[in-house]
């Protein structure tokens, strides 16, 4: 038999091989497909069949418009001028392109050494479902689990049994100061049908670094507070994923659960003293706030203490 | 809302001819075949004609072959019966009905038009 | 030709009964199979498509069925607006067929 592809919505003529091209004409089409459960014998007269499987005029069958449930089997058997039989068989695959891949939510640029969501690759009105890839520098990414993880979805459209596809890539960059190049691919897997490529996208790869801008705020402003006062130290860190904060008073750590925040309630003159708060980040050591100086005192009339914080709540240092 | 309406019906002599008219309305019309169905007083449902989407193809029960002609214009969404040599037999509320093939059976119907042959 | 034989032509029943309708084709029409509903003095109305499938707007007391060529209507309540004729149709060849008809009727 002989395999044919044809695109979904666009006409196909099969031909019945040894017809006669006019009639008289001794022909039977019959075809096994998704609108059969058997095989189904055309009349030649035509009929309701018509308007997806027509006899023509020259004995070959015309599919005006082929959908998915034409996926199947066709067979035509004619006798010839000279009485001898003659047999056509065809099996119809159909295929529909989709439009060009996207990559959404691209991301901006990528930390070494940490997992980071490149985006998301989504492919929408395909048949056969087919396959996204991805490429890096042009180069075929494979998934390996670990510094390269892809999630992919697939979903089929209710009504028109279209394809949706998404693959959702993460990477693990090795080292910073690069900039590569990340593409998307969809291909349906059919002979002579090129894959569908996205725009790349160029990310720059930052080395993790010390989190920016660690910070100790502290309430109420200036660190000084009345006996029984309540005082409320929060260490701000611009970190993914947030980091564990531990606490520091005069130069030795707080024996207290990892927290971003330090809440000294009814404060009396033994918590007077500096404090600071450390951040462990898992891909880099240790970092440290500037400290700020806590003042308990029976008037709030002193001006702020040095290493203490100013008008704008920020622990500076001196 | 689909809607299909049928006219054109009256009382008529024995060999005499008329033409039904059905408009359409609420859907592509050039989408679908569209159907002739008849229903003879205190009877049941008979086929009449069929016509593809485009018009080029037609297709009758051997009870009206080459006495009726269904056509259409999908300009004005409009299919048509032409009755000819009608005969006492003939008479029947006449239905417009969207479909005809294997995609649709039918599926929408007009409320019908009554055709009286009689002298 | 197909013939769609429809059986029983009549039958009574009471609101709330089970009503099963049968029409058999003389030979193999796949799933092209209708069911229809028709009221005195009004056009039909299509129940079920393709043998099983409700129509859009028809309560879920109606169902079709399909054994080979054994097509069955079934209401599973019957309720008063029910009660009217109900016509089989086979769309596999020409010419299109109907089945003879089932009059339900209030016993």
């Known amino acids: 038999g002989q395999n044919i592809t044809a695109r979904i919505g666009e006409p196909l003529v099969l031909s019945c091989k040894g017809a006669p091209k006019k009639p008289p004409q001794q022909l039977e089409w019959k075809l096994n497909t998704g609108r059969t459960e058997a095989w189904k014998v055309l009349s030649p007269q035509g009929g309701p069949w018509d308007s997806v499987a027509r006899i023509l005029p020259n004995g070959s069958l015309l599919l005006p418009a082929t959908g998915i449930v034409d996926e199947g089997t066709f067979r035509c058997r004619a006798t010839n001028r000279r009485g001898k039989e003659v047999k056509s068989n065809y099996r119809v695959r159909v295929y529909q392109i989709p439009g060009k891949p996207e990559i959404v939510d691209p991301a901006s640029e990528l930390t070494a050494s940490v997992p980071n969501k490149v985006g998301t690759c989504v492919s929408e009105g395909s048949y056969p479902a087919g396959t996204l890839s991805w490429h890096l520098d042009g180069k075929l990414l494979i998934p390996d689990g670990k510094e390269t993880l892809v999630k992919e979805e697939t979903r089929r459209h209710p009504e028109t049994g279209l394809f949706t596809l998404r693959s959702e890539l993460t990477v693990i960059p090795t080292q910073g100061g690069t900039h590569p190049t990340f593409s998307c691919s969809f291909s349906l897997g059919l002979p002579r049908r090129r894959p569908l490529n996205t725009a790349p996208i160029q990310l720059r790869v930052r080395e993790p670094g010390p989190p920016e801008g660690i910070q100790l705020l502290v309430e109420p402003e200036g660190g000084i507070v009345a006996p029984g006062g309540t005082v409320t130290l929060t260490c701000a860190i611009s970190a993914q994923p947030p980091p564990q904060v531990h606490w520091i008073k005069d130069g030795a750590p707080l024996p207290l659960a990892p927290s971003p925040v330090l809440l000294l309630p009814e404060v009396g003159h033994e918590d007077e003293g500096t404090y600071s708060c450390v951040a462990t980040h898992p891909s880099h050591g240790p970092q440290e706030s500037p400290p700020v100086s806590i003042r308990v005192t029976e008037t709030g009339d002193e001006g702020p203490a040095e290493g203490s914080v100013g008008e704008s709540g920020l622990g500076t240092l001196a | 809302e689909v809607q299909l309406v049928e006219s054109g019906g009256g009382l008529v002599q024995p060999g005499g001819s008329l033409r039904l008219s059905c408009a359409a309305s609420g859907f592509t019309f050039n989408n679908y075949w569209m159907t002739w169905v008849r229903q003879a007083p205190g009877k049941g449902l008979e086929w009449v004609a069929s016509?593809?989407?485009?018009?080029?193809?037609?297709y009758y029960p051997d009870s009206v072959k080459d006495r009726f002609t269904i056509s259409r214009d999908n300009a004005k969404n409009s299919l048509y019966l032409q009755m000819n040599s009608l005969r006492a037999e003939d008479t029947a509320v006449y239905y417009c009905?969207?479909?005809?093939?294997?995609?649709?059976?039918?599926?929408?119907w007009g409320q019908g038009t009554l055709v009286t042959v009689s002298s | 030709d197909i013939q769609m034989t429809q059986s029983p032509s009549s039958l009574s029943a009471s609101v709330g009964d089970r009503v099963t309708i049968t029409c058999r084709a003389s030979?193999?029409?796949?799933?092209?199979v209708n069911w229809f509903q028709q009221k005195p003095g009004k056009a039909p109305r299509r129940l079920i498509y393709r043998a099983t499938n409700l129509a859009d707007g028809v309560p879920s007391r109606f169902s079709g069925s399909r054994s080979g060529t054994d097509f069955t209507l079934t209401i599973s309540s019957l309720q008063p607006e029910d009660f009217a004729t109900y016509y089989c149709?086979?769309?596999?060849?020409?010419?299109?067929?109907f089945g003879g008809g089932t009059k339900v009727e209030i016993k």
């Open positions: 016509i593809d989407n485009s018009g080029d193809n037609t």
């Open positions: 030979q193999d029409v796949g799933i092209y």
């Open positions: 149709l086979e769309f596999d060849e020409h010419p299109l067929t």
């Open positions: 009905a969207r479909g005809g093939d294997i995609r649709v059976g039918l599926d929408v």
